[in-house]
């Protein structure tokens, strides 16, 4: 606890002090006082540098004195033999004695008192910037007129902060301008304009005189402009050293004028005004700006329109133009939007065709569709080449955006039929010789595939089973082979309206209009073993002449078996209808005269016993196309016959082409259109 005064006595005083003693006293007086320590008695063993016994006076880290020996007062009116004056409020006194004393020494008596110090004069560093006032136990600072004392209670400054300028034009100067500005001051001025305007500061060189920089180039007094995260300055010296026109790109500007204690000059004066915030004329590729101007400022609106083949993509929506506004921050709205090349996207796939993965799907890119040759060809022309158009669609010169359509190639077997191995009445065949051949397993019969969705057969094949199971692509009709081939599922059976339905079909003698169509649920995939046969044309070129050769195929009765396991085929000539009439019916169910022969029937066979038979019904009588020798068309369908191994009757398909086309068109799916 600090005290104002006190007494310090050596151990046993006034008796002799003991040997080997070390004792210390910590003196503390109140804050704001110094200490006056004085000795009235001193009798300590003398030694060089007081090395044996001593009394030591320490102030902080400084030794103020070290005493030994005997002292007496020089002044008869004063008992003081030694004294110390320190301007601090703390002091330490340490007494030490060694192990022996040659004489009897009585030690010391000392007193301390708190004394006033003059902070204004006693220290090297002046505590006040302007006026210092001492009082007992302390001091206070004071300021000249128009100055005020800062919160540190030591420094004086002028009250030059807090001004906010909001007008679009104005003038600001340093305090007292053009008289010298106050020292030791920090003046802050704020310019706050409405958003969208930037503060532009203008100065004249002669309106600026601020204490120059030191030898290191640091401004002692300085003027600084701060606009957001941008700073202009610090500036100092005689004549303004910065740009005379400062565009801050901000609507808010802070002006900071900092002065030190020395070297006052006349200061500075500036003008400011608010400019609408400019937005840069940006280079946006592949677009045009409307209106076109040399300079765009706050609130200007432009329409940016993409050139043909370019679009602006925002989210999933593509547009050809957008609006952009010059914003208050000097940036354009929608600046992220760009005119990019139109992307036509991954081209749509097509059934039975393909399109190579394009290197690019952007405007101007070219893709090519191809059909799965040789089983499909491009029906609707156009060559299959599409380019990415400006509207974002893949476009063909002929078809426009319509996709190409790959349709099956008809009438072209992968392997031509050759009568290699002679079998009575026919040859072994491979399904690749007759890829249009369809197998019906109940009743055991045949049919001809004419496109992806339709099978042509004889009416008598399907009249008793309107949901026939059919197979394509297999030479053998063993269950094991059919299990691995393609089964066709019917959607609907269309029997020719001219076919007479009977109560007892076994007794039929009239096979006129023996033709039917089966619409399939799913399209058939074409390939080497499955491919349609063509239909006859309607021109006279497709009128058959006697002797014209045709191919028949099927799994019907042979000389060896009631049902063939592997496909059989034969080449037969067309014969006059009378040849069929002349053959005696093998197992007649009625009079020979009851059997009907019409122009809708073709008679063929009679050569080397080659003929169709039970189980071949519905299969095609395939004739070479007169206009394209590489193709076969279905001239007839196996219908009936008087006797196997003689002549057979075939439905004349040419007479039914209109009915076939009409039926298919009326019962097509959108997928086919």
């Amino acid at each position: 606890e600090p005290t104002m005064y006190g007494e310090i006595l050596s151990p046993n005083y006034p008796q002799a002090y003991p040997s080997e003693v070390e004792k210390s006293w910590d003196i503390e007086v109140p804050e704001g006082y110094g200490i006056h320590l004085y000795f009235t008695h001193l009798d300590i063993e003398l030694s060089e540098n007081c090395a044996y016994d001593s009394v030591q006076i320490i102030s902080g880290d400084t030794e103020e004195g070290r005493l030994c020996g005997q002292r007496s007062s020089n002044n008869p009116h004063s008992p003081i033999v030694e004294e110390f004056q320190v301007p601090y409020n703390k002091l330490q006194v340490i007494f030490k004695s060694d192990f022996s004393n040659e004489e009897r020494f009585t030690g010391f008596a000392a007193y301390y008192v708190a004394t006033d110090i003059n902070e204004c004069t006693d220290f090297v560093d002046v505590p006040c910037s302007h006026f210092c006032n001492n009082f007992i136990g302390g001091y206070f600072c004071s300021c000249p007129p128009e100055y005020f004392l800062h919160d540190d209670m030591k420094n004086c400054g002028v009250n030059c902060s807090g001004d906010v300028f909001t007008a679009l034009i104005g003038e600001i100067a340093s305090p007292n301008y053009p008289k010298p500005y106050p020292e030791n001051s920090r003046c802050e001025y704020q310019i706050r304009l409405e958003k969208g305007f930037q503060v532009v500061v203008t100065l004249r060189r002669e309106d600026f005189d601020v204490e120059a920089a030191d030898s290191a180039g640091n401004c002692l007094d300085s003027l600084v402009f701060v606009a957001g995260d941008r700073q202009f300055g610090p500036y100092c010296g005689h004549g303004f050293p910065g740009p005379l026109n400062i565009e801050t790109k901000s609507n808010a500007l802070d002006i900071i004028f900092q002065t030190d204690l020395t070297g006052q000059k006349k200061g500075w004066k500036l003008r400011y005004h608010g400019d609408p915030m400019p937005c840069p004329k940006e280079d946006t590729p592949n677009s045009v700006w409307e209106p076109a101007k040399a300079k765009y400022v706050f609130r200007d609106v432009v329409q940016i329109t993409c050139l043909d083949g370019f679009e602006v993509v925002e989210g999933r929506v593509g547009a050809t133009s957008f609006y952009s506004t010059c914003q208050s921050n000097g940036k354009w709205s929608n600046s992220k939007l760009k005119c990019q090349p139109v992307d036509c996207g991954i081209p749509e796939s097509i059934e039975n065709g393909k399109v190579e993965d394009p290197e690019s799907t952007l405007f101007g890119s070219v893709i090519r569709y191809t059909c799965e040759e040789p089983y499909y060809y491009m029906e609707n022309g156009g060559g299959g080449e599409y380019h990415c158009a400006g509207n974002g669609s893949w476009v063909n010169e002929v078809l426009g955006p319509e996709l190409p359509k790959c349709v099956p190639v008809c009438g072209v077997p992968r392997e031509p039929f050759e009568e290699k191995q002679r079998i009575i009445g026919g040859s072994d065949a491979d399904i690749k010789n007759f890829p249009w051949q369809v197998f019906f397993d109940n009743p055991w019969a045949g049919g001809a595939l004419i496109n992806e969705y339709w099978v042509l057969t004889a009416a008598h094949v399907v009249e008793g089973n309107r949901e026939p199971t059919m197979y394509v692509g297999s030479t053998s009709v063993q269950t094991s082979r059919l299990a691995k081939s393609k089964m066709l599922t019917p959607e609907h059976v269309f029997i020719h309206p001219g076919w007479k339905l009977l109560e007892v079909p076994e007794g039929r003698t009239n096979f006129d209009n023996d033709i039917a169509l089966v619409r399939l649920k799913d399209p058939v995939k074409m390939g080497p073993t499955v491919s349609p046969i063509c239909l006859p044309g309607t021109s006279s070129d497709y009128n058959l002449m006697d002797g014209d050769l045709g191919l028949i195929s099927g799994w019907g009765r042979t000389e060896k078996r009631d049902r063939a396991v592997r496909l059989k085929a034969a080449r037969l000539p067309v014969a006059p209808l009378r040849k069929c009439k002349e053959v005696k019916v093998e197992k007649p169910t009625a009079d020979a005269e009851a059997y009907v022969f019409t122009p809708n029937m073709i008679c063929a066979g009679g050569e080397k016993g080659m003929d169709s038979c039970k189980g071949d019904s519905g299969g095609a009588f395939a004739v070479q196309d007169p206009n394209d020798k590489t193709k076969f068309y279905a001239a007839g369908l196996v219908s009936w016959g008087p006797q196997c191994g003689t002549y057979g009757l075939y439905t004349r398909v040419k007479n039914y082409v209109d009915w076939i086309m009409k039926t298919m068109q009326e019962n097509s799916t959108p997928r086919e259109d």
Epitope: D441, T479, S480, L482, D562
Partner: antibody
Framework: EVQLVESGGGVVRPGGSLRLSCAAS????????MSWVRQAPGKGLEWVSG????????GYADSVKGRFTISRDNAKNSLYLQMNSLRAEDTALYYC??????????????????WGKGTTVTVSS | DIQMTQSPSSLSASVGDRVTITCRAS??????LGWYQQKPGKAPKRLIY???NLQSGVPSRFSGSGSGTEFTLTISSLQPEDFATYYC?????????FGGGTKVEIK
């Protein structure tokens, strides 16, 4: 040349087991169904069991049901008959025969067009 | 199970004779019937399938007929090599069943 060769016959005690094999050659084995037929000494023919081309469908005579199992390994062109709980009345000459099955949903069967020479099974204590 | 009754169980005939063997099914079997010939110590051999179809390689003197429940095997002119036992087989439903056999002997 189409050929079927049976093996695995022999003498076995009642209650015992035997496995007959039939090796096929000269035709595409996995296109055909197969049957086992037996003939007791001095008696007529009795169909024992049959299996379709891929082994998914089997049939048995009532006299062997639950005791005999027919199977095939198409990779090895082989037919098998596993005979368990054998009885004296199972003593016979066992033939394997080839069956043809045509059609996809409606089946047309042509049974036993080719036969093997047979293998003898004797069940005796 | 379908029972197949074959008759006669045996017959004696001379070379050149016309021989007829009958098979009766206990229920209708359409035409799902085959005829087999077996000679002593040999495996059976198929003659006729689907009631009336002659197996490839079989002489044309053999013929089959019938449908439903009544079936016939006819040998139009018996030859020395035709002396054997003949069996019918129904395959209309599982279990397949053979007739009891007809033994054709030399008179």
């Amino acid at each position: 040349e189409v050929q079927l060769v049976e093996s695995g016959g022999g003498v076995v005690r009642p209650g015992g087991s035997l496995r007959l094999s039939c090796a096929a050659s000269g035709f595409t084995f996995d296109d055909y169904g197969m049957s086992w037929v037996r003939q007791a000494p001095g008696k007529g023919l009795e169909w024992v069991s049959g299996i379709n081309w891929e082994g998914g469908s089997t049939g048995y005579a009532d006299s062997v049901k639950g005791r005999f199992t027919i199977s095939r390994d198409n990779a090895k062109n082989s037919l098998y008959l596993q005979m368990n709980s054998l009885r004296a009345e199972d003593t016979a000459l066992y033939y394997c025969a080839r069956d043809e099955q045509l059609g996809g949903q409606t089946y047309y069967y042509y049974y036993m067009d080719v036969w093997g020479k047979g293998t003898t099974v004797t069940v005796s204590s | 199970d379908i029972q197949m009754t074959q008759s006669p169980s045996s017959l004696s005939a001379s070379v050149g004779d016309r021989v007829t063997i009958t098979c009766r099914a206990s229920q209708g079997i359409r035409n799902d019937l085959g005829w087999y010939q077996q000679k002593p110590g040999k495996a059976p051999k198929r003659l006729i399938y689907t009631a009336s179809n002659l197996q490839s390689g079989v002489p044309s003197r053999f013929s089959g007929s019938g449908s439903g429940t009544e079936f016939t095997l006819t040998i139009s002119s018996l030859q020395p090599e035709d002396f054997a036992t003949y069996y019918c087989l129904q395959y209309n439903q599982v279990p397949l069943t053979f007739g009891g056999g007809t033994k054709v002997e030399i008179k």
